[in-house]
Amino acid sequence: HSFGPGPGLGTPRSPCNARGPCRLFFRVCLKPGVSQEATESLCALGAALSTSVPVYTEHPGESAAALPLPDGLVRVPFRDAWPGTFSLVIETWREQLGEHAGGPAWNLLARVVGRRRLAAGGPWARDVQRTGTWELHFSYRARCEPPAVGAACARLCRSRSAPSRCGPGLRPCTPFPDECEAPSVCRPGCSPEHGYCEEPDECRCLEGWTGPLCTVPVSTSSCLNSRVPGPASTGCLLPGPGPCDGNPCANGGSCSETSGSFECACPRGFYGLRCEVSGVTCADGPCFNGGLCVGGEDPDSAYVCHCPPGFQGSNCEKRVDRCSLQPCQNGGLCLDLGHALRCRCRAGFAGPRCEHDLDDCAGRACANGGTCVEGGGSRRCSCALGFGGRDCRERADPCASRPCAHGGRCYAHFSGLVCACAPGYMGVRCEFAVRPDGADAVPAAPRGLRQADPQRFLAGVIAVIVVVVIAIVAGIVVLVISRKKRMAKYEKAEIKEMGEMHRELNA
């Protein structure tokens, strides 16, 4: 039995994280066969925490492959009958010790989960579970507390209406106080600790014990081939019980002696050295969360679980945070709804993963009369006067850039700006200098618009401005109407999507 890094997983890791001494605790949780780890359901069959935990101190360069484990057994008492099929959850917790750790600190190092099938009264079943880089070797068994007996810890109590009616020498039956305890059914003298019976007057031994009353420990010393060990001074006692005495084969396996040891012929559905391992098939539904079980048609073949989206683990028992992979593009909000992933897109983006930019030139164009310019795989907006920003949605001060040349005064206008030119200058931006002698402006003004004819010139400028203003206003109206239509379409789609999301979240 050990807890440590698995084989081929690089440098052995210390559980203490180089933070001084720590202790390991194990929490064992038993759930009925239908339990599903992902729902964090109660440990309905029982739970227990290991005790007498040795302190582990990390030494530089020391291998973490054999960590000191809690002494003794972790006993998980269960009520009522033993279900046979159950879920076993073993959590390895680290308690960081020492002042520099800021007082005791608890961390979950590893959690292993698996569905198991195990008859009560059988020998120890061995298991190895890997999770991440850790590997846990452990054994488990189920034992009945008297008066319950058999593979399912069925109660052998006589039904009575009240405890007061129990006959002489009989006590109320536990945990069924409305019944009475039955007389002993095992062979008289059968060890209550190391023996059990499924039929009256029999005494079957648990692993490690032998003899007619299961009171003799099986030795693993040099006396194995010469039978039972005697007192230290006398060596080994001969003869003694054979390897098959007390039948070490569980679950109905038949024992045969082979060169001083034994071999078990296991019935269908069981395997292992002592027939202690029960074969879980796909028909038992070992995969959680609707996972698909493949293989495992018979107990001798292993099964594999193919997990639904959002789940992982050998039995699909672990929920995956798929949003941690940041699947939503362009700043979209990720929602993991279990079997579906939804992205709530920011304004201007759409698609299952917010991958479509609605603001590209093919989609919703630049606002407020701006024109879209594409190039180099990107787009930008060339904004109309008075607007700025990525999409021309921000109002800009058209006079901020001092557009009027030669001391002209700038006046902000709803459609842009107007320059009032200083004497001697003309043009939309006061860019033309007018010669005082009435000669051509520099650069030349159009023929017929001489300074000598200021009224006609002013009328021309006003006419140009009016035409420009009308064109801009018309453009804005057209763009606003088309944008409203497009926005309404996307808002409708977004409302529908949010409704679906809300329904799925509620489901």
Partner: antibody, heavy 117, light 107 residues
């Protein structure tokens, strides 16, 4: 051998009700999600609904087309899942199959429901 | 819901020939696609899961490929018992949806 056997189909008038049953054998029924999938005559497959495990409070999910009209329940002690169909419409006419898991690995032989006046 | 489009609707082939069935998804479904076989008067049967994995007991002549939006079921050499309707189904997004089916008939 795994077997799923549907029953309870028949002819019913629009607006009527029907209760389908699916009895499972050869599997540890209480460990399996159960689904109903239907197939209209000459058409493809359509998922109807699903019921999960006791540990998931027997959570149910339904297709939009049947939401509010159909109800799925299960009795683990009897290895049986049910589909209660109310306010039936002509478009509910189909062969109804029960299937297991998220991936529909085991299927029953189906039971025919005809909604006609 | 994700829409699956199968093509062709009907495939007329002779025993021993190779059959290639296509399934296109309306959006990315990763590899969460299964293929089902349905013979007349029978219930559907799972053939392929996870786009390319054969389910328990399915003969090696059936193979699946693809990821994202384009998927293919290939029957390398048609046996008489393979003439049936084949459906693809997506299991990426809940609820699961199916394609309209491809009928493989004897030429």
């Amino acid at each position: 051998e795994v077997q799923l056997v549907e029953s309870g189909g028949g002819l019913v008038k629009p607006g009527g009700s029907l209760r389908l049953s699916c009895a499972a054998s050869g599997i540890t029924f209480s460990n399996f999600w159960m689904n109903w999938v239907r197939q209209a005559p000459g058409k493809g497959l359509e998922w109807v609904g699903q019921i999960r495990l006791k540990s998931e409070d027997y959570a149910t999910h339904y297709a939009e087309s049947v939401k509010g009209r159909f109800t799925i329940s299960r009795e683990d002690s009897k290895n049986t899942v049910y589909l209660q169909m109310n306010s039936l419409k002509t478009e509910d006419t189909a062969v109804y199959y029960c299937t297991t898991g998220y991936y529909f690995d085991y299927w029953g032989q189906g039971t025919t429901v005809t909604v006609s006046s | 819901n994700i829409v699956l489009t199968q093509s062709p609707a009907t495939l007329s082939l002779s025993p021993g020939e190779r059959a290639t069935l296509s399934c296109k998804a309306s959006e990315n479904v990763g590899t969460y696609v299964s293929w089902f076989q349905q013979k007349p008067g029978q219930s559907p049967r799972l053939l392929i899961y996870g786009a390319s994995n054969r389910y328990t007991g399915i003969p090696a002549r059936f193979s699946g490929s693809g990821s994202g939006t384009d998927f293919t079921l290939t029957i390398s050499s048609l046996e008489p018992e393979d003439f049936a309707v084949y459906y693809c189904g997506q299991f990426y997004s809940f609820p699961s949806t199916f394609g309209g089916g491809t009928k493989v008939e004897i030429k």
